[in-house]
């Protein structure tokens, strides 16, 4: 990752994608250390920005405005050279977000996938963006960029992610840009959590008082395992919501979560998954499906779950 013999390496922390008003640290790594350095912004000329100021270790830039978007380079201090400075570093593009209306982000076939599968993340907008960028939360590398395609009054781009491994699980957002200001990105799409299943042993799922209940009777689904899962996730077939609960250690050395569904009104097929706090978007194999049947007078659906939806929030820790 480091630059060549006389070429420093310029990087940004926490990310090259910075919201308007946010801050970003630019680090110029030169000759196995952070020495004094100068920064250049490649706008109209290669003159040092910030009035030729010299920085040590890192420069915290912000609060950023759209004018900060662009390509940066640095030169490291080299006292015994002719100029006193190294060759220019690699180019580093800083992108500033929040400059256009947010696009939409969808996952095909869905956000819950088995290890080894491929998912298409489709970013689209009627703003007709020329380029779309896909960024995973917590990653400092540049986002993936694709040229949009126009279809039926919207522009869209399909990002192919896979084969899926635990490192690719996480929270994704996409952005759009237009030619006038290609590094001034839109507001972020709503976050989309990509969850990878099938990595650990499946938990077991049971129903109390049983899988067949009278209409109006209270039902609780219990998910348990010998594995020390921190969180259990309960999903119902055909529903975009998942519920999650912290696992509780039991006296029989299992780890269990009890999901109260309330008074039974409608049947359904349920599955549960376990996950660990350190990797909240990497889940176990699915439990065997559990069909809950309601006898009597079923109405349209269960009460709305009070837990977070699976659309976002899965990949954040449960506090």
């Amino acid at each position: 990752l480091m630059g060549g013999q006389d070429k420093p390496f310029l990087s940004a922390r926490p990310s090259t994608v910075v919201p308007r008003g946010g801050h970003v640290a630019l680090q110029c790594h030169y000759r196995r250390g952070f020495n004094n350095f100068m920064l250049y912004k490649e706008d109209r000329s290669h003159v040092p920005i910030f009035h030729g100021r010299i920085f040590q270790e890192s420069f915290i830039m912000g609060p950023v405005t759209p004018a900060h978007a662009g390509t940066y380079r640095c030169r490291g201090s080299r006292p015994h050279s002719l100029t006193g400075w190294s060759a220019p570093s690699n180019p580093l593009v800083i992108m500033v977000t929040g400059n256009h209306r947010k696009p939409s982000l969808l996952a095909h076939p869905g956000p819950l996938l088995k290890s080894g599968e491929t998912v298409i993340l489709q970013c689209w907008s009627d703003v007709m963006f020329e380029h779309f960028f896909l960024h995973r939360e917590g990653i400092s590398e540049d986002p993936s960029r694709l040229v949009g395609q126009i279809h039926d009054g919207v522009s869209k781009a399909n990002f192919s992610i896979g084969p899926l491994m635990p490192v690719l699980a996480g929270t994704y957002r996409c952005y759009g840009s237009v030619p006038h200001s290609p590094y001034q990105l839109s507001a972020p799409s709503d976050p989309l959590d990509i969850v990878i299943t099938g990595l650990y042993e499946k938990p077991s799922l049971s129903a109390q008082p049983g899988p067949t209940v009278q209409a109006g009777e209270n039902v609780t689904l219990s998910c348990s395992s010998w594995s020390s899962y921190d969180i259990y996730h309960l999903s119902r077939e055909g529903e975009a919501h998942e519920r999650r609960l912290r696992a509780v250690p039991k006296v029989n050395r299992t780890f269990q979560a009890d999901f109260p569904l309330g008074p039974a009104t409608h049947g359904g097929t349920y599955r549960c998954f376990g996950s660990f706090r350190a990797l909240p978007c990497v889940w176990s194999n699915s439990s065997d499906p559990l069909l809950v049947s309601v006898t009597g007078n079923p109405s349209s659906s269960w009460p709305s779950p009070t837990e977070p939806s699976s659309k976002s929030g899965i990949c954040r820790h449960l506090h």
Partner: antibody
Framework: QIQLVQSGPELKKPGETVKISCKAS????????MNWVKQAPGKGLKWMGW????????TYADDFKGRFAFSLETSASTAYLQINNLKNEDMATYFC????????????WGQGTTLTVSS | DVLMTQTPLSLPVSLGDQASFSCRSS???????????LEWYLQKPGQSPSLLIY???NRFSGVPDRFSGSGSGTDFTLKITRVEAEDLGVYYC?????????FGSGTKLEIK
């Protein structure tokens, strides 16, 4: 259909102020930025700058910093160009032109507003 | 600023002939994102300009395939294979890669 309709011709004296409007219709106004382009009599086109209709942020070319101001009335889908302290060299036709977000710059243009500056 | 130089100033042609417009930029106009934002506009007498070609060689919607754009770096060309009466007017090249964006001085297409 998409249209940009500009206000009518203006006759002003040096030192006065003019405000030219550009009313957009047929699309979501805040989805596409708006540019202003100057054309002096018998001359070519000169890009003055643009305004981001989503954030309201203007960008001015160096020659148009100071006396020139871009503004918006988003609820009326209208962009404005105001020129203060008018000078003889401001006499020109001014066009508004929509940002073509998808790889091009000006996909729809207003019909132009002719500004005459004369004492 | 990037200076866009267009030649010739005036281009007399006969209807049905080919017309070729040249545009040269004072510096490379490849944007750091890899795109070359070079466009061609036609301004017919008494009208607003209209977009013909974007990103060097892409025809804008509704533009006849008689129009084509080519070039790279600093040298660009617009060609009309068979000139029709409706093509008359002033042709401007434009660069949108470096702020401030700049137009060429224009080439007037007229009938011989």
């Amino acid at each position: 259909q998409i249209q940009l309709v500009q206000s009518g011709p203006e006759l002003k004296k040096p030192g006065e102020t003019v405000k030219i409007s550009c009313k957009a219709s047929g699309y979501t106004f805040t989805n596409f930025g708006m540019n202003w382009v100057k054309q002096a009599p018998g001359k070519g086109l000169k890009w003055m700058g643009w305004i981001n209709t989503y954030t309201g942020e203007p960008t001015y070319a160096d020659d148009f910093k100071g006396r020139f101001a871009f503004s918006l009335e988003t609820s009326a889908s209208t962009a404005y160009l105001q020129i203060n302290n008018l000078k003889n060299e401001d006499m020109a036709t001014y066009f508004c032109a929509r940002n073509g977000n998808f790889g091009y710059y000006f996909d729809y243009w207003g019909q132009g507003t002719t500004l005459t500056v004369s004492s | 600023d990037v200076l866009m130089t267009q030649t010739p100033l005036s281009l007399p042609v006969s209807l049905g002939d080919q017309a070729s417009f040249s545009c040269r930029s004072s510096q490379n106009i490849v944007h750091s994102n890899g795109n070359t934002y070079l466009e061609w506009y036609l301004q017919k007498p008494g009208q607003s300009p209209s977009l013909l070609i974007y990103k060097v060689s892409n025809r804008f919607s509704g533009v006849p395939d008689r129009f084509s754009g080519s070039g790279s770096g600093t040298d660009f060309t617009l060609k009309i294979t068979r000139v029709e009466a409706e093509d008359l007017g002033v042709y401007y090249c434009f660069q949108g890669s470096h702020v401030p964006f700049t137009f060429g001085s224009g080439t007037k297409l007229e009938i011989k």
